[in-house]
Interface confidence: low
C-alpha cells in the first residue's frame, strides 16, 4: 500500500493525538516544547540575555583560537518523535536533543532510523528550512516571546512552535545532503562544505557557519516502507561567542574547542 511516502508528518497543529505503540518501545514523545512557561526555554532565554549583557566580552580569554572568532553556535535540537505502528513503517528517532558548539567547530545532528522491511537501501534526506521567526532576536527579548507563546498556550495549542511551524512558501528551503547506500550527495547550496551523513543517518558538519542557523529535517524514504514517523527535525542557532556556556545552559553539551 503506497502512502505518505516522502515526509510522513510528525507534528500536528494541536500537538494532540500522540501515541507510543508498545511494538515501538524505542519511540519517545517530543522531548521539549518552546512555550513561555517552559523552564528550560526560560533558562535558554536568560542565558542568551546574559551573553548579550556581558557584551560578549568575556570571550575565551587565553584560548589562541578566540581572536577574531567571537561567536558561539547554540544548537537546539528540538526533535519531533511521535510514533505510530503501521504494518510496514519507518521510524526516525534522535539520541541527543541538545548541543552547544563553537562557530567553526564541528557538530553532529543525530538521526537514526529503523525499518520493518529492508529489501532496498532507504534514502536519507536532510533538508534545511529557515526559521519562521527570528529565534535569536526573541532570545534577547523574552517578554515578547512569552506574550506570544503564552497566548498560544491559552488558546489550547501548547504544541505550537512559532519558529518551526509555518508554510514553506514564506521561508528558505534547501536540501542539505542525501544518502543512499554509501553515496552521499550535497545539495547545490552546500557544495564545497565539509558536510556528510555518517553512521545511520547523522548529519555532520566539520565546521559550522553563520548561515547554518535554521531547522534541519531528517527524513528517511523507502519505496517499501511508506508509513510511519519518518521525519524528525532539529533547530540550529548561531549566536555570539563567549565562555561559560555549559554553566549558563544546564543540560547542553559543549562541543570541542580546537585550534
Amino acid at each position: 500500500m503506497q502512502q505518505d511516502g516522502l515526509g510522513v508528518g510528525t507534528r500536528n497543529g494541536s500537538g494532540k493525538g500522540r501515541s507510543v505503540h508498545p511494538s515501538w518501545p524505542w519511540c519517545a514523545p517530543r522531548p521539549l516544547r518552546y512555550f513561555g512557561r517552559d523552564a528550560r526555554a526560560r533558562r535558554a532565554q536568560t542565558a542568551a540575555m546574559a551573553l548579550l549583557a556581558g557584551g560578549l566580552s568575556r570571550g575565551l580569554g587565553s584560548h589562541p583560537a578566540a581572536a577574531g572568532r567571537d561567536a558561539v553556535v547554540f544548537v537546539w535540537l528540538l526533535l519531533s518523535t511521535w510514533c505510530t505502528a503501521p504494518a510496514r513503517a519507518i521510524q526516525v528517532t534522535v539520541s541527543n536533543p541538545y548541543h552547544v558548539v563553537i562557530l567553526f567547530q564541528p557538530v553532529t545532528l543525530p538521526c537514526t532510523y529503523q525499518m520493518t522491511s529492508t529489501p532496498t537501501q532507504p534514502i536519507v534526506i536532510w533538508k534545511y528550512k529557515s526559521f519562521c521567526r527570528d529565534r535569536i532576536a526573541d532570545a534577547f527579548s523574552p517578554a515578547s516571546v512569552d506574550n506570544q507563546l503564552n497566548a498560544q498556550l491559552a488558546a489550547g495549542n501548547p504544541g505550537y512552535n512559532p519558529y518551526v511551524e509555518c508554510q514553506d512558501s514564506v521561508r528558505t528551503v534547501r536540501v542539505v545532503a542525501t544518502k543512499q547506500g554509501n553515496a552521499v550527495t550535497l545539495g547545490d547550496y552546500y557544495q564545497g562544505r565539509r558536510i556528510t551523513i555518517t553512521g545511520n543517518a547523522d548529519l555532520t558538519f566539520d565546521q559550522t557557519a553563520w548561515g547554518d542557523s535554521g531547522v534541519y529535517y531528517c527524513s528517511v524514504v523507502s519505496a517499501q516502507d511508506l508509513q510511519g514517523n519518518n521525519e524528525a527535525y532539529a533547530e540550529l542557532i548561531v549566536l555570539g561567542r563567549t565562555s561559560g556556556v555549559a554553566e549558563l545552559l544546564p543540560g547542553f553539551q559543549a562541543g570541542p574547542i580546537e585550534d
Epitope: D4, V8, G9, I123, I125, E165, V175, Q180, T185, V221
Partner: antibody, heavy 114, light 106 residues
Framework: AVTLDESGGGLQTPGGALSLVCKAS????????MNWVRQAPSKGLEWVAG????????DYGAAVKGRATISRDNGQSTVRLQLNNLRAEDTATYYC????????WGHGTEVIVS | ALTQPASVSANPGETVKITCSGG????????YGWYQQKSPGSAPVTMI???NNRPSNIPSRFSGSLSGSTNTLTITGVQADEAVYYC??????????FGAGTTLTV
C-alpha cells in the same frame, strides 16, 4: 472505494482569491500525502501543492509559490488549497490527488479567472 | 521536468513501451507514476504508481519498470488504449513534477 471530491471552483476575478476543498473517503486519510494538480486548457498536468499526512511538510509548485497555502483537516478528511492574487494563467481544472506517488484522483473542479 | 516522447503508435495486439526520465533529481532515487487521460478535461487515471505498482482496477497488461533513472510503461497487447499518458515523479521530498505527455495512437 477511494473517493476524492473537489469543490470551490467557478468563475474568479483576477487579483482575487479562491479556496478549493477536497473531501476524501474510503481510506485512512491521515496516512496519505495529498496533492493538488491542475491542468490548463489544452495543456499538460502541473503539480501545484502537496502536504504530508500529519501536516508537518508542505511544498508548492513554482507557479504558485508565495500565493498558495495547502492545509488539511485529518478529522474531517479534507484538504484545502487557498490561492491568492489570481491570474489568468491560473485558469485550469484542479484535481485533488492522493499519495506521494499519486494513486488516486478526484474528478476535478474547473476554475476560470477572467 | 520529466522527459517522455511526444507520441508513439502501435497496432492492436502489439507491445508499446513509453519511457520517462529526469525524476528524483534531489536524492538519487526514483519514484515514478503513469497517468492516463482519455480526453482533455477528463480526470487522469493512475495506471502505475511507485514505479511498478498497479491499482487493482487496472488491467495486468499495463506494467512499469525502473532501470537506472528511467521508468518505462509497458502496454502488452495494446487494445483501445488511445490516450495521453503522463509520467509523474516525486521531486524534492514531497514536490511533484510531470512530463509533457505522450500521445498513444493505436
Amino acid at each position: 472505494a477511494v473517493t476524492l471530491d473537489e469543490s470551490g471552483g467557478g468563475l474568479q476575478t483576477p487579483g482575487g482569491a479562491l479556496s478549493l476543498v477536497c473531501k476524501a473517503s474510503g481510506f485512512t486519510f491521515s496516512d496519505y500525502q495529498m496533492n493538488w494538480v491542475r491542468q490548463a486548457p489544452s495543456k499538460g498536468l502541473e503539480w501545484v501543492a502537496g502536504i504530508n499526512g500529519r501536516s508537518s511538510w508542505t511544498d508548492y509548485g513554482a507557479a504558485v509559490k508565495g500565493r498558495a497555502t495547502i492545509s488539511r483537516d485529518n478529522g474531517q478528511s479534507t484538504v484545502r488549497l487557498q490561492l491568492n492574487n489570481l491570474r489568468a494563467e491560473d485558469t485550469a481544472t484542479y484535481y485533488c490527488a492522493r499519495g506521494s506517488s499519486i494513486d488516486a484522483w478526484g474528478h476535478g473542479t474547473e476554475v476560470i479567472v477572467s | 521536468a520529466l522527459t517522455q516522447p511526444a507520441s508513439v503508435s502501435a497496432n492492436p495486439g502489439e507491445t508499446v513501451k513509453i519511457t520517462c526520465s529526469g525524476g528524483g533529481s534531489y536524492y538519487g532515487s526514483y519514484y515514478y507514476g503513469w497517468y492516463q487521460q482519455k480526453s482533455p478535461g477528463s480526470a487522469p487515471v493512475t495506471m502505475i504508481y511507485n514505479n511498478n505498482n498497479r491499482p487493482s482496477n487496472i488491467p495486468s497488461r499495463f506494467s512499469g519498470s525502473l532501470s537506472g533513472s528511467t521508468n518505462t510503461l509497458t502496454i502488452t497487447g495494446v487494445q483501445a488504449d488511445e490516450a495521453v499518458y503522463y509520467c509523474g515523479s516525486i521531486d524534492s521530498n514531497i514536490a511533484g513534477v510531470f512530463g509533457a505527455g505522450t500521445t498513444l495512437t493505436v
